[in-house]
Structures are given as C-alpha cells and as structure tokens.
C-alpha cells in the first residue's frame, strides 16, 4: 500500500546531517522499517520479539538509526547536494497480524545552509 | 450489492476432505483480508482461519495441520481445503472480510463488514 | 489468547427501553473491539468497529463505547427487530481471532 507523503516533519537536520523520521503505530510489536533512496535501500532495522517478550532488533544495511516506541529515525551525515532525492520510510508489519508493507516519504531538499562543510 | 456466497459444504464421513468456496462480488476482493468463521447450530462463533491480502495465512488451532486457506484474487475467489474432517468440525462455515489500514502513526481496523450466507458442512458417518 | 466474556448471557427487555451489554477482554486491546448482530437463520451483522464507529448502514439507536477491556454495547431504543444475538469479537492480539460467548436479547 503506498500512502504517499508523510503528513508529518521528516527530515530534521542539524549539524550537516538529517535525521530521516519514520514513524509507525504505537500497536505494533514487530516489524522491519527500510529507509529507500528513490529505489535502493539505504538502511533497514528490524524489531521482533522473542519468548519471554525478549526484543531483538537486527540490521541488515546498518546505519546510524534510533528506535522509539512510535519511530525509526536514521540518520545520514556529511550531506552535499547529491543527497536530494526522494526518501521513504517503507514499514513491514509483522505483528499484529495480518502482514501489510506502507510507503510514506517526501523529497529531501539541500539549501546551502545546511551543508557540512561550508567553504567560507 | 456487496455479495460473499460460499458453496461446497456437503455431507462428508469423518477423515474425509472438503473443499469449501467463497465467490465475492461488488467489492475490492483483493484490498480484503479474508477469513472463515464457523458456528455450530444454536452455539456461538468460532474463527478458524484468516488470509491477508499478501497471502499470509492463520489457523486457529483445532485446524491447525488440517486445514489450509488460500485466495485467487483474479477470480474473486477464497478457498478452505479440509483435510481429517472429525465430527466436531460440523457447523455452519461463514467466509467473511475485513480491512487494515496503516498511515503513519495510525492503523485503522474495519471490522468484519462483509459476509457470506453460509454453507453447512455435517461430517458423520 | 484474548478471552472475551459477555453478560448478561441474557437481556430480557421490552420495545421502547434502553439495553446496555457488556464486554470484558482479558488483556488491554485498546479499541480494537467489535460488535456483531445475529438473528435466527442468517449471517452476522457488523454493528460497531474500534469499539465506538457505527458500520455502514446501522442506525444512529446503536452505540459502542470503551477501551482497553471494557467495552459496551447500547441501543438507546429497542425496535422489534433489535432482537437477537449479540456478539463482541476483537483482532489485534491473534491468532486466534476471539468472539465472545454472545448475548441473547429477548423480548419480556
């Protein structure tokens, strides 16, 4: 299913990197959140949960992420303008059932301000 | 008129097979999640199994290994193939569908908001 | 597995008054609950979704309300052919998908 644009603040930037919000249902236990640049994937992360409620959390493209209760945030550093491109947040629902896959993103916009590594 | 009819539900002898129909109409077949639910005579409901619109399947566990739910979307179709029946799988089977939706932050569920009539299926010997 | 319990097993109440059945879950499934309606001889009918949303067609007489495990069901004023069989059913902690034991209203 392909949501189209987040409804909302995706990109947070802060010192020459972005952090990429993807958020979720708070009801869901288990899933897999893949970052995607245009069609490739950049990252992924994924959350199950084992007996006993054990939670293990795998990445098969690692980057930096974070994982809230409602969230995955990744976060790209370095940027130049090669990073403007379309991203989105595709989510795997594993648990509850059934298993649905949802697309959100928007487009990454680089302005010289939030460049790494001005040259003065 | 949104329609589900089954069909297929006969008489059978105990560890015998059945295969049980469920033909949709004047809906998204395939943006449905569907399931079978059955209902012994003047007892309550029982849910049996469940298929997503990725073709993932469930089983409640008295079916488990027996039974085996499948769809064929280009024909609007959902199927329950029954394998071991005993005595205690007699009931009416209903195939119903419902519908989850996930945006962002929220997931939506439905509610089983659409159903068949029912086909009886009596496994004695 | 959810257990979903229902009381009373039956509601004996006549044309015109109020009826009020109940649905208790056995772990919090927020407002993932619904209520179904059965009469003698036909399919279920869905009645209210995430606990409180009227289905397509229901008449404004019928409401849902609670969350997490307590749920209730109200028909502001019975018609004749509001009796029946009631059920709750929840889907967010499955399989299996759970239906309660059910609520027979019936006319005094």
């Known amino acids: 299913e392909i949501n189209g644009s987040a409804n909302y603040e995706m990109f947070i930037f802060h010192n020459g990197g972005v952090q990429i919000l993807c958020k979720y249902p708070d009801i869901v236990q288990q899933f897999k959140m893949q970052l995607l640049k245009g069609g490739q994937i950049l990252c992924d992360l994924t959350k199950t949960k084992g007996s006993g409620n054990t939670v293990s959390i795998k990445s098969l493209k690692f980057c930096h992420s974070q994982l809230s209760n409602n969230s995955v945030s990744f976060f790209l550093y370095n940027l130049d303008h090669s990073h403007a491109n379309y991203y989105f947040c595709n989510l795997s629902i594993f648990d509850p059932p059934p298993f649905k896959v949802t697309l959100t993103g928007g487009y990454l916009h680089i302005y010289e301000s939030q460049l790494c590594c001005q040259l003065k | 008129e949104v329609r589900l009819v089954e069909s297929g539900g006969v008489l059978v002898q105990p560890g015998g097979s059945l295969r049980l129909s469920c033909a949709a109409s004047e809906f998204i077949f395939n943006s449905y999640d569907m399931h079978w639910v059955r209902q012994v005579t003047g007892k309550g409901l029982e849910w049996v199994s469940a298929?997503?619109?990725?073709?993932?399947?469930y089983y409640s566990d008295s079916v488990k290994g027996r039974f085996t739910i499948s769809r064929e979307d280009a024909r609007n179709s959902l199927y329950l193939q029954m394998n071991s029946l005993r005595a205690g799988d007699t009931a009416v089977y209903y195939c119903?569908?419902?519908?989850?939706?996930?945006?962002?932050?929220?997931?939506?569920?439905?509610?089983?908001?659409?159903w068949g009539q029912g086909t009886t299926v009596t496994v004695a010997s | 597995e959810v257990v979903l319990t229902q009381f009373p097993a039956t509601l004996s109440l006549s044309p015109g008054e109020r009826a009020t059945l109940s649905c208790r879950a056995s772990q919090n499934i927020r407002s993932y609950l619904a209520w179904f309606q059965q009469k003698p001889g036909q399919a279920p009918r869905l009645l209210i979704y995430?606990?409180?949303n009227r289905a397509t067609g229901i008449p404004a007489r019928f409401s849902g309300s609670g969350s997490g495990t307590d749920f209730t069901l109200t028909i502001s004023s019975l018609e004749p052919e509001d009796f029946a069989v009631y059920y709750c059913q929840q889907r967010i902690s499955w399989p299996p998908i759970t239906f309660g034991p059910g609520t027979r209203l019936e006319i005094k």
């Open positions: 995430g606990a409180s």
């Open positions: 298929i997503g619109t990725a073709g993932d399947t």
């Open positions: 119903t569908g419902d519908r989850t939706v996930v945006r962002g932050v929220n997931y939506y569920y439905y509610g089983m908001d659409v």
